[in-house]
Every structure is written in C-alpha cells, then in structure tokens.
C-alpha cells in the first residue's frame, strides 16, 4: 500500500435545500484505470461511510447502495455532491481515494471538509 496526497476544501456551506458539493483532488502517481472514492463522516464520536463509488477513468461514478451522493470525475478530480442534508448532519466529511488498478495499490485520505448545514426557517403563515 502506497500513500497518495488528496486535497479537498476546508469548509463548505450546504445550500438551503440541503445540498453540499465539493471537489476531491488526488495526486495520481501513475495511470490508474480503476478508482474507488469513499466519503467518510467523522462526527458525534462516530465514523460513517456515507457513500462510496468505483469508476473506470473517463466513465461515470457508480455509487454503492442507497446513496445520498452523486458525482462526476474529470482527470484526477472528483466532484462530489451530498443531498438531503439537515443541520444535524453538520460535520467533517473526509474524502478517501484508492487506486485499485493497475498495481500498485495507492491510498490517499484528505484532511476533511467541514460541511455546515443550516435548516431553513419555516415560512411565516400568510393570509395572502
């Protein structure tokens, strides 16, 4: 297992609709053809794999399971979007990148993006 640098923004503010997007960029030391990206949430004394995707370079990301994430890739960058967030989901979201094929296997873990989510204020009742 070889180490690899992964960069991601320090802070992102989710939209009023609970959507947060950020870029995860990795310094690929070679020509990887199969890449796995995992988003980890570290908060509340827990570590949670929020979503994970494997993709072949140049193809769309295919996310595992009941994913609340979507994403696209471009070169050594992955554009990740997490949906359905609420204030309680505020936390540190860490990008983990694995170069699966061809060997050797590379692993990189970013420092994390602090995502802040603010629940929208309910609209006041109106007679109009």
């Amino acid at each position: 297992c070889k180490a690899m640098h992964v960069a991601q923004p320090a802070v992102v503010l989710a939209s009023s609709r609970g959507i947060a997007s950020f870029v995860c960029e990795y310094a690929s030391p070679g020509k990887a053809t199969e890449v796995r990206v995992t988003v980890l949430r570290q908060a509340d004394s827990q570590v949670t794999e929020v979503c994970a995707a494997t993709y072949m370079m140049g193809n769309e990301l295919t996310f595992l399971d009941d994913s609340i994430c979507t994403g696209t890739s471009s070169g050594n960058q992955v554009n990740l979007t997490i949906q359905g967030l609420r204030a309680m989901d505020t936390g540190l979201y860490i990008c983990k990148v694995e170069l699966m094929y061809p060997p050797p296997y590379y692993l990189g873990i970013g420092n994390g993006t602090q995502i802040y989510v603010i629940d929208p204020e309910p609209c006041p009742d109106s007679d109009f």
Partner: nanobody, 125 residues
Framework: EVQLVESGGGLVQTGGSLRLSCAAS????????MGWFRQAPGKDREFVAA????????SYADSVKGRFTISRDNAKKMAYLQMNSLKLEDTAVYYC??????????????????WGQGTQVTVSS
C-alpha cells in the same frame, strides 16, 4: 418488522475475540439497515456499529473502530459483529437492531424498530 435473535456472547479475557451473530426472520432482511448497540450496567444503551442494506457501507463508534467489524449475509438473513482486542470496557449486553430505512449520514439515529433480546459479553482480566 423482523424478528431478531442474537448469539455468540460469553466470557472472554482481555485481548480476546468473540463473534456475535444476529439471525433474522420475517420480513425481507435486505430491506433493513442493521445495527449493533450495547448497554453496560448502569449506563445508557449506546451505538456500536451499523451496516447498509447491501453491506457496502458501514459506520462505527470511535470506541470500537479498528477492533470491531460489522458484516451481513443477506442470503442467510444474518448480521455479524466480529470483536477483536476486547477490553474490560466492552463488557455489556449487545443487541442487534433493524431499521427499515436506506443509508444516510447518521445511522446511529435511524428508527430501529426491531430489536433482539440481547447477548451478554463479559471481558475479564
């Protein structure tokens, strides 16, 4: 709801290992996120680990990360908790639970509506 029965608990020495099993019956097992919780004497029930419906995504409490591994076998309707490097503070009754919801960011807070009866794990020095 699903019916859940845990097994595999027991007495083990510090540093030892145990594998807990959770057998499900009833509804379609693969529709449920599965979790493990524990309750030590005189303490509140606490989250240990959870696993998504297909088994591809997992969540762990910081206190067990790197020592415990959660897994599942949908064909057998089973969930498992492999516990290694056990510590005295891991002593508790361990419960498996099922939540009829998709994955998310905070599986410890999912609406687990089915619970097993629990299995005792005692770690001694």
């Amino acid at each position: 709801e699903v019916q859940l029965v845990e097994s595999g608990g027991g007495l083990v020495q510090t540093g030892g290992s145990l594998r807990l099993s959770c057998a499900a019956s009833g509804r379609t097992f693969s529709n449920y996120t599965m979790g493990w919780f524990r309750q030590a004497p005189g303490k509140d029930r606490e989250f240990v680990a959870a696993i998504s419906r297909s088994g591809g995504l997992k969540s762990y409490a910081d206190s067990v990360k790197g020592r415990f591994t959660i897994s599942r076998d949908n064909a057998k309707k089973m969930a498992y908790l492999q516990m290694n490097s056990l510590k005295l503070e891991d002593t508790a009754v361990y419960y498996c639970a099922a939540a009829p919801v998709p994955w998310g960011t905070r599986p410890s807070t999912f609406p687990y509506d089915s619970w097993g009866q629990g299995t005792q794990v005692t770690v001694s020095s």
